[in-house]
């Protein structure tokens, strides 16, 4: 009866998800087969979230729409791991949005859900951010810095990363 | 007032290369893109790509990749389209517009023709 | 990428008339949406945004309506100066394409 109404559960939790994600990827968490990790098919996961490379060339605005529609925000780096673990995935010529900008100009720098933003857990490429107009942050890659962040003008069409929670079941 | 001021018509041969220019006034050049539509004679209007004025980032549609290069001169508030290796379907009307705030197309140039034939 | 149909490519109208255009993308393009007007010999004239914002300055005869995938421009009584060239175009994600026009001539 109970793994029956847990199963139940766990039907009507995938069909919320169905209409943006009809395919995820599960994995078993420690040692309990009761509770499942999951990603949406084909994003990455690590610790406690999914990823998702967004080819798409969209402006910050549009980029941060498009993972909205699909459950997530654009991307929020919380430390090295996280970074080192995203740009794996990621084209050494390309730029990718982040979801990080700054709205009225005054470096007054935000993260899209809130989340503090700490100087100390930054990684802008020397020199950046570097213009009061450029006010939404980007991660690419500099043959002398490798990966970092920069700022550019949000209008700019590029491709980016979205982040949402991992799926319990 | 915002203007955008484009260059003369030019007549080329196929082969050649163009470069239209687009002198912008009237608002802070740096601070908004400057796109360029064309519209071949009779035809509609086709996306070619764009410029941010203030680094010189580009985005071009991917028909004119490798065709069309956009560049900038802060110091003259004016941005250049180049189109090579031109064909006769290139002829068109080529127009500069800028991207407002809103991120629509509020402020077009007059428009360049420019004519391919041998 | 996402392509912009929009219909009919021609339509006959008298003055006082109400017109209606419609453009339809191949993919949700959220609300990003504007149309044009085009005169013979002159650059394009943004009408409309987000798909139902009128520009600066632009008679209230004009309004737009939509969502996702399907989108709609209308003239609530044609005036002498709206027979014209209309153009719908999406700004979701580039190639940022526009619909084929719609030619509006006086009956």
């Known amino acids: 009866n109970f793994m029956y109404s847990k199963t139940v559960k766990r039907l009507s939790k995938l069909r919320e998800y169905q209409q943006y994600h009809p395919s995820l990827t599960c994995v078993m968490e420690g040692k309990d087969i009761e509770d499942w990790s999951c990603c949406p098919t084909p994003w990455t996961s690590f610790q406690s979230s999914c990823y998702f490379i967004s080819t798409g060339m969209q402006s910050w605005t549009k980029s941060q729409k498009n993972c909205s529609v699909m459950g997530a925000d654009l991307v929020v780096i919380n430390t090295r791991e996280e970074q080192d673990f995203i740009i794996q995935n990621l084209k050494r010529n390309s730029s990718y949005f982040l979801g990080l900008s700054d709205p009225g100009g005054r470096r007054h720098w935000q993260w899209v859900d809130q989340t503090p933003y700490n100087e100390n857990v930054t990684f802008w490429h020397s020199g950046e951010p570097n213009n009061l107009d450029e006010r939404c942050a980007i991660i690419n890659f500099r043959s002398s810095e490798e990966w970092g962040w920069n700022d550019i003008h949000c209008h700019v069409p590029q491709k980016s990363i979205c982040k949402m929670k991992k799926i319990y079941i | 007032q915002v203007q955008l001021v484009q260059s003369g018509a030019e007549v080329k041969k196929p082969g050649a290369s163009v470069k239209v220019s687009c002198k912008a006034s009237?608002?802070?050049?740096?601070?908004?893109?400057i796109h360029w539509v064309r519209q071949a004679p009779g035809q509609g209007l086709e996306w070619m790509g764009t410029i941010y004025p203030g680094r010189g980032d580009t985005s071009y549609n991917q028909k004119f990749k490798g065709r069309v290069t956009m560049t900038r001169d802060t110091s003259t508030s004016t941005v250049y389209m180049e189109l090579s290796s031109l064909r006769s379907e290139d002829t068109a009307v080529y127009y500069c517009?800028?991207?407002?705030?809103?991120?629509?197309?509020?402020?077009w140039g007059q428009g360049t023709l420019v004519t391919v034939s041998s | 990428d996402i392509q912009m149909t929009q219909s009919p490519s021609s339509l006959s109208a008298s003055v006082g008339d109400r017109v209606t255009i419609t453009c339809r993308a191949s993919g949700n393009i959220h609300n990003y949406l504007a149309w044009y007007q085009q005169k013979p010999g002159k650059a394009p004239k943004l009408l409309l945004y987000d798909a139902e914002t009128l520009a600066i300055g632009v008679p209230s005869r004009f309004s737009g309506s939509g969502s996702g995938t399907d989108y709609t421009l209308t003239i609530s009584s044609l005036q002498p100066e709206d027979f014209a060239t209309y153009y719908c175009q999406h700004f979701w994600s580039t190639p940022y394409t526009f619909g084929g026009g719609t030619k509006v001539e006086i009956k």
């Open positions: 009237g608002y802070t050049f740096t601070s908004y893109l």
């Open positions: 517009a800028r991207m407002g705030d809103n991120e629509y197309f509020d402020y």
